[in-house]
């Protein structure tokens, strides 16, 4: 399954929207930095496309869930958030189309399940951090920066998969 070129453009638009969402000076938030333990190894080049698609899907689904909460709606600009949802929704559709075409439909490798679980735990850590920080503006900015970084790393994986073919 070849992800459409529009998928790459959508990924770039998503990053641009995340960048635009910033609401306060980041310099006031330095002391709120946190190690969320992004499972970078789960996005390594050792994976075949069949194993990678569901992991990328999980990553985007979790980002969608994170930014769909009422706490998120209160933190960010509504117009930008709506555009952000649209981009993520389109990317989820692209990835789901690949799965439907047969990629990863056969017996799910244990390694892939472990990777999906690692991504879920990563987002659980993010959610816990926000809760502990009482969803403060700085906590949201730290999370936004983290999502930009992790989304960018996973997008780079998509690009490397495309260029390998």
């Amino acid at each position: 399954c070849d992800l459409p070129q529009t998928h790459s453009l959508g990924s770039r638009r998503t990053l641009m929207l995340l960048a635009q969402m910033r609401r306060i000076s980041l310099f006031s938030c330095l002391k709120d930095r946190h190690d969320f333990g992004f499972p970078q190894e789960e996005f390594g080049n050792q994976f075949q496309k069949a194993e990678t698609i569901p992991v990328l899907h999980e990553m985007i689904q979790q980002i969608f869930n994170l930014f769909s909460t009422k706490d998120s709606s209160a933190a960010w600009d509504e117009t930008l958030l709506d555009k952000f949802y649209t981009e993520l929704y389109q990317q989820l559709n692209d990835l789901e189309a690949c799965v439907i075409q047969g990629v990863g439909v056969t017996e799910t490798p244990l390694m892939k399940e472990d990777s999906i679980l690692a991504v879920r735990k990563y987002f659980q850590r993010i959610t816990l951090y926000l809760k502990e920080k009482k969803y403060s503006p700085c906590a949201w900015e730290v999370v936004r920066a983290e999502i930009m970084r992790s989304f960018s790393l996973s997008t780079n994986l998509q690009e490397s998969l495309r260029s390998k073919e």
Partner: antibody
């Protein structure tokens, strides 16, 4: 390969203005902040200030606030440090270094080679 | 501002020695502490970040420990190329501040 390349050494007279540069390459320039550090002859490191190239937001050390201006041009991946009126006490080596912003990643992991500024009448 | 105090300001050691440099912050900074090495005429080089994480490409003889206000840089077995000046730096809050440096010289 990540690189920060600074402009060459400068010799200036007191009262003159100066703008030195730091060009980033090999990474996404707007994803990292750029900090500036001063080292006077035979002395230690002093943090001057920092810029977020994505929107040119800046923060300064109180010791340097109003003495220097930090700016950036993201279209050419370059950060700047400038003086409107140099003093003899500005004679020093100036370094730029990249900072990961709010991400949990190594601080100041890449540095420029330094720009030596000499101010003498 | 957070003050960073390094000790000693200089030390003499021999190749193979175990060297320890300490850094104290004037207030708690969690683990937001970095260590740099600088050789004459060169830019500083990051060794340790977030108190104990070894920067990529740095030899494992370098290690960092501590949290809160007290931190330590240890060189387990000093090598000829390790003779340099070492700086700690807090990255907890602005303004970022450096220690005054520790010069490691050949005995």
């Amino acid at each position: 390969e990540v690189q920060l390349v600074q402009s060459g050494a400068e010799v200036k007279k007191p009262g003159e203005s100066l703008k030195i540069s730091c060009k980033g390459s090999g990474y996404s320039f707007t994803s990292y902040w750029i900090g500036w550090v001063r080292q006077m002859p035979g002395k230690g490191l002093e943090w001057m200030g920092i810029i977020d190239p994505s929107d040119s937001d800046t923060a300064y050390s109180p010791s340097f606030q109003g003495q220097v201006t930090i700016s950036a041009d993201k279209s050419i991946s370059t950060a700047y440090l400038q003086w409107s009126s140099l003093k003899a006490s500005d004679t020093a080596m100036y370094y730029c270094a990249r900072h990961p912003g709010l991400n949990w990643a190594p601080d100041f992991d890449y540095w420029g080679q330094g720009t030596l500024v000499t101010v003498s009448s | 501002d957070i003050q960073m105090t390094q000790s000693p300001s200089s030390l003499s050691a021999s190749v193979g020695d175990r060297v320890t440099i300490t850094c104290r912050a004037s207030q708690s900074i969690g683990s937001a502490l970095n260590w740099y090495q600088q050789k004459p005429g060169k830019a500083p080089k990051l060794l340790i970040y977030f108190a104990s994480s070894l920067q990529s490409g740095v030899p494992s003889r370098f290690s960092g420990s501590g949290s809160g206000t007290d931190f330590t840089l240890t060189i387990s077995s000093l090598q000829p190329e390790d003779f340099a000046t070492y700086y700690c730096q807090q990255s907890y809050d602005f303004p970022l501040t450096f220690g005054q440096g520790t010069k490691v010289e050949i005995k």
